[in-house]
């Protein structure tokens, strides 16, 4: 692998950390923007921070540090920094990995706890506004009503449910959602991992390279 | 369908309770509604349950007259009307999911 | 309670011709969620009512395809495509956005 293959080498992961960059940018602006303009309030009560514009900064936060660093790393050729995204992007799809792995094995516990969170946040539709936020808008956005149903709303359901007939419950209606276009997820999921270990491949040989770079130029 | 009880003739200042029986699905699955139509005059709303909890809503006007229950062991739901009035002569429907309507019990308040 | 508002009567229609039937509301029946909550219903003579048009423009099971339900917020109408002998009859309009739901006085079609 010569002079040529290392710049391109380098102008790819240039280029396409500076695409995930832009991307970064983006979906730290419009979690910043529902963190301003859009209360959807908060639906867990034990899980406080757990709200979308939450998710989104830290999401867009992660993409635009691993970012920079595979931007600044490939463009100055600098070993620390590529070898800092590459460890950055492994603890990310280790995380991924675990993380997906627990989801399967501990499918029925996480439906349960969800199932309790959101019981308990249904009991306090009427006396917390930030609850009420996040139920009206869920109910409203997927045309809703309750976890399992209407009938969850035992004192009637609220203004925010469709109010001619009873619907499947936001809960049950998620989960279906889910369960259908699993096959779709999936292949996000893989083609997230991919690109991970593409980046990882691609600083991992850029590094080797500046390495043997080196030590043809003398240095 | 929707099945409902037969024609009523009552005094004024008595109570009736109407029925209907639902054949074909569960009334759990969706809300009972009644509603009432006065002799050559317009529907009216007068309120709904659901069966799977038994919550009740009834339109103003109603509240106090009205009182809607329901049995889900066997698939019907109730309407009792009391200190009836020669204004509560009327038709009564049952609806459930406003897809199925009974075929109507006449009241008659009359003395 | 929001006020349903209806003509007593439509204008005679000729067997085979289109019919089209007017409805208002005093204020938008259109839901956070985008559906608008206008159901009309078709009352024969000396029969109980059935449902016509469901969430505005939603042909009810079993209604032919002749039926068909359009409007804004505010403004409804049902449009009847080819008028048969059997669409004799009372049709009313009914909000479901909010409780009490209410009913429109009904529009009775004449047929010359």
């Known amino acids: 692998m010569g002079m040529s293959s290392l710049k391109l080498l380098k102008y790819v992961l240039f280029f396409f950390n500076l695409l995930f960059w832009i991307c970064g940018c983006c979906i730290l602006g419009f979690g910043i923007y529902l963190l301003i303009h859009n209360n959807f309030g908060v639906l867990f009560h034990n899980l406080p921070s757990l709200t979308l514009g939450n998710v989104f900064v830290i999401v867009g936060s992660i993409i635009m540090v691993v970012a920079f660093l595979g931007c600044m790393g490939s463009i100055k050729e600098n070993k620390c920094l590529l070898m800092s995204f590459f460890i950055l992007l492994l603890i990310i799809l280790l995380a991924e990995v675990t993380l997906a792995i627990l989801l399967f094995v501990y499918e029925q516990k996480l439906n349960e706890y969800v199932a309790k969170g959101l019981t308990d946040s249904i009991h306090r539709y009427h006396s917390d506004n930030s609850t009420k936020a996040a139920w009206d808008s869920i109910q409203s956005f997927l045309q809703c009503c309750g976890i399992n149903g209407t009938s969850d709303w035992t004192s009637g359901p609220p203004a925010s449910c469709p109010s001619d007939r009873k619907v499947e419950g936001c809960y049950a209606k998620a989960r279906l959602w889910f369960h259908s276009n699993f096959l779709y997820i999936g292949i996000i999921t893989i083609c997230v991992c991919v690109i991970e270990v593409l980046g990882m491949s691609f600083a991992l040989t850029l590094n080797c390279q500046i390495d043997k770079t080196s030590q043809t130029i003398g240095l | 369908q929707l099945q409902q009880s037969g024609a009523e003739f009552v005094r004024p200042g008595a109570s009736v309770k109407l029925s209907c029986t639902a054949s074909g699905f569960n009334i759990k699955d969706d809300y009972i509604h009644w509603v009432k139509q006065r002799p050559e005059q317009g529907l009216e709303w007068i309120g709904r349950i659901d069966p799977a909890n038994g919550y009740t809503e009834y339109a103003p006007k109603f509240q106090g007259k009205a009182t809607i229950t329901s049995d889900t062991s066997s698939n019907t739901a109730y309407l009792q009307l009391s200190s009836l009035t020669s204004e509560d002569t009327a038709v009564f429907y049952c609806v459930w999911h406003w897809d199925y309507w009974g075929q109507g019990t006449t009241l008659t308040v009359s003395s | 309670d929001i006020v349903m508002t209806q003509a007593a009567f439509s204008n005679p229609v000729t067997l085979g011709t289109s019919a089209s039937i007017s409805c208002s509301s005093y204020?938008?029946?259109?839901?956070?969620?985008?559906?608008?909550?206008l159901y009309w219903f078709l009352q024969r003579p000396g029969q109980s009512p059935h449902l016509l048009i469901y969430r505005m423009s939603n042909l009810a099971s079993g209604v032919p395809d002749r039926f068909s339900g359009s409007g804004s917020g505010t403004d409804f109408t049902l449009r009847i495509s080819r008028v048969e002998a059997e669409d004799v009859g009372v049709y009313y309009c009914a909000q479901m956005l909010e409780r009490p739901f209410t009913f429109g006085t009904g529009t009775k079609l004449e047929i010359k």
């Open positions: 204020k938008s029946l259109q839901h956070n969620n985008g559906i608008t909550y």
